[in-house]
Interface confidence: medium
């Protein structure tokens, strides 16, 4: 004869409020006759939840019919979960006896606790910009979850970091937690179109993690390189001179030409380019009117950044007296 | 699944412009820059510039600055090249395709080209 | 601008043959090199990234090798699907594709 064994599957059940809730349970073997019940709980303290033959339990419902002979599936479903529903499950076996039925053997338990979905990991970045080289902080924060046990990971880009600190709130029992990391990640140059990624995984989430961004072009700032040059060709009585502002990020620039120490009001012409990077490449062109009075112009062209302190390049125009000559007979 | 669809194939005379679109599906859009390349009958490859489709930033190939555009419109996951001033030896098979990282691994942030739209064919002829 | 030379131009195997294509550049490229196949009135489709990377998908008789200049693409075992134009493209510096070799049968 084939000993009786009470299986119920699942040692942990997450459960959400208002949902509800499957236990299940099989036996092995129709023998020894008797009733099989479900209670809350062990020893003289335990609480019955449904009983086939007797009482009245209106949130409880069979999954199988127990009427039927050959029934060995005795699962139930408890409707309307609330908070006060939490605890562990047995399913026990009880022996037909006279006076009374005697309990036969017990399952192992289903807990049965309350599951809540983490929300949405929200990331932050530093409120201001910094330049690359340097250590900037971001936080993640995930809230209303339950259990408390969970895995929070940080990644910059495809690249998994380790440089970051976790906490979860309360520490003691609760109904629900939060979760808060915050990670230290090194800006690159080329950290423009760079992403920080927390990725929380909870078992509430079967397995499909939930993530937050952050774009590090939010916390960057790629401050210009500058460089003033005088191009050889002359366009009738005019020199052509160039600023090149490069590599830089954000957008936010402004550039102006001073003649002499003198700021100039007339329009320039200039082309903004993006690098493959993100960042941008401004060059900006001055036209300078050449003459027998101008001996020594010096050019200044300087650029304020993301509101910075400006910089600035200066060039000594050289003009050669054949281009004097020949600026002087030239036609306007 | 991922990927890039282009318009149908065009017939232009000498002088005109061409427009030829190119529709993303299956990603984030503006997560990752498109490339236009072109391909002469019989001939090799040839890479006219990017599209970054978050910013609209863009870089052509010398060859081509001054004669092509670039642009996208992100609300319909769509990126444009129009080529200019069309000469017989225009006439090409013309390709978008998108990167295989959507981020900057390394200080150039250039990468390889994985996706590619099914190619459009531009005749210019008189 | 960094020049791609491909060699050769056109090479003729059989199947079940050991091919090798080779893709030399004007100056030091590292390992930034990708290889293309592209068959007639159809899109390049990406082999190999990084000089020695496979592409997800691609068959594993495929392989890159070199750094530097000098580069080669190697297919151990030619199979039917295999003939087709194979192109190295540069991307150290912007883009430049390889002028192409033609795998023919024999």
């Known amino acids: 004869e084939e000993e009786l064994q009470m299986i119920q599957p699942e040692k942990l059940l997450l459960v959400t409020v208002g949902k509800t809730a499957t236990l299940h349970c099989t036996v092995t073997s129709l023998l020894p006759v008797g009733p099989v019940l479900w209670f809350r709980g062990v020893g003289p303290g335990r609480e019955l939840i449904y009983n086939q033959k007797e009482g009245h339990f209106p949130r409880v419902t069979t999954v199988s019919d127990l009427t039927k002979r050959n029934n060995m599936d005795f699962s139930i479903r408890i409707s309307s979960i609330t908070p006060a529903d939490v605890g562990t499950y047995y399913c026990v076996k009880f022996r037909k006896g006279s006076p009374e039925n005697v309990e036969f053997k017990s399952g192992p338990g289903t807990e049965m606790a309350l599951g809540a979905k983490p929300s949405a990991p929200v990331v932050l970045g530093p409120a201001a910009r910094t330049t690359p080289e340097h250590t900037v902080s971001f936080t993640c924060e995930s809230h209303g979850f339950s259990p408390r046990d969970i895995t929070l990971k940080w990644f910059k880009n495809g690249n998994e970091l380790s440089d970051f600190q976790t906490n979860v709130d309360p520490t003691g029992q609760s109904v629900a937690y939060s979760i808060r990391s915050t990670a230290r990640v090194v800006l690159d140059p080329w950290d423009v179109r760079s992403q920080v990624i927390c990725e929380v995984a909870h078992v509430t989430l079967q397995g499909d993690p939930l993530r937050g961004t952050a774009n590090l072009s939010e916390a960057i700032r790629v401050p210009p390189t500058l460089e003033v040059t005088q191009q050889p060709m002359r366009v009738g009585n005019q020199v052509n001179v160039t600023c090149q502002v490069r590599k830089f990020y954000p957008q936010s620039l402004q550039l102006t030409w001073s003649e002499n120490g003198n700021v100039c009001q007339r329009e320039t012409a200039s082309t903004l380019t993006e690098n493959k990077d993100g960042t941008y490449n401004w060059t900006s062109w001055f036209l300078v009117n050449i003459s027998d009075q101008r001996d020594d112009v010096v050019l200044t062209c300087q650029v304020k950044h993301d509101g910075q302190l400006a910089v600035s390049k200066r060039l000594a125009l050289e003009v050669t007296v054949h281009q004097k000559d020949q600026s002087s007979d030239a036609t306007p | 699944q991922v990927q890039l669809v282009q318009s149908g194939a065009e017939v232009k005379k000498p002088g005109a412009s061409v427009k030829v679109s190119c529709k993303a599906s299956?990603?984030?859009?503006?997560?990752?820059?498109i490339h236009w390349v072109r391909q002469a009958p019989g001939q090799g490859l040839e890479w006219m510039g990017w599209?970054?489709?978050?910013?609209?930033?863009?870089n052509y190939a010398q060859k081509f600055q001054g004669r092509v555009t670039m642009t996208r419109d992100t609300s319909i996951n769509t990126a444009y090249m129009e080529l200019n001033r069309l000469r017989s030896d225009d006439t090409a098979v013309f390709y978008c395709?998108?990167?295989?990282?959507?981020?900057?691994?390394?200080?150039?942030?250039?990468?390889?080209?994985?996706?590619w739209g099914q190619g459009t064919m531009v005749t210019v002829s008189s | 601008d960094i020049q791609m030379t491909q060699s050769p131009s056109t090479l003729s195997a059989s199947v079940g043959d050991r091919v090798t294509i080779t893709c030399r550049a004007s100056q030091s490229i590292s390992s930034w090199l990708a290889w293309y196949q592209q068959k007639p009135g159809k899109a390049p489709k990406l082999l190999i990234y990084k000089a020695s990377s496979l592409e997800t998908g691609v068959p594993s008789r495929f392989s890159g090798s070199g750094s530097g200049t000098e580069f080669t693409l190697t297919i151990s075992s030619l199979q039917p699907d295999d003939f087709a134009t194979y192109y190295c493209q540069q991307y150290d510096s912007y883009y430049t594709f390889g002028q192409g070799t033609k795998l023919e049968i024999k």
């Open positions: 599209i970054n489709p978050n910013s609209g930033g863009t």
């Open positions: 299956g990603y984030t859009f503006t997560g990752y820059h």
């Open positions: 395709a998108r990167e295989r990282v959507g981020y900057c691994s390394r200080p150039s942030c250039l990468d390889d080209l994985n996706i």
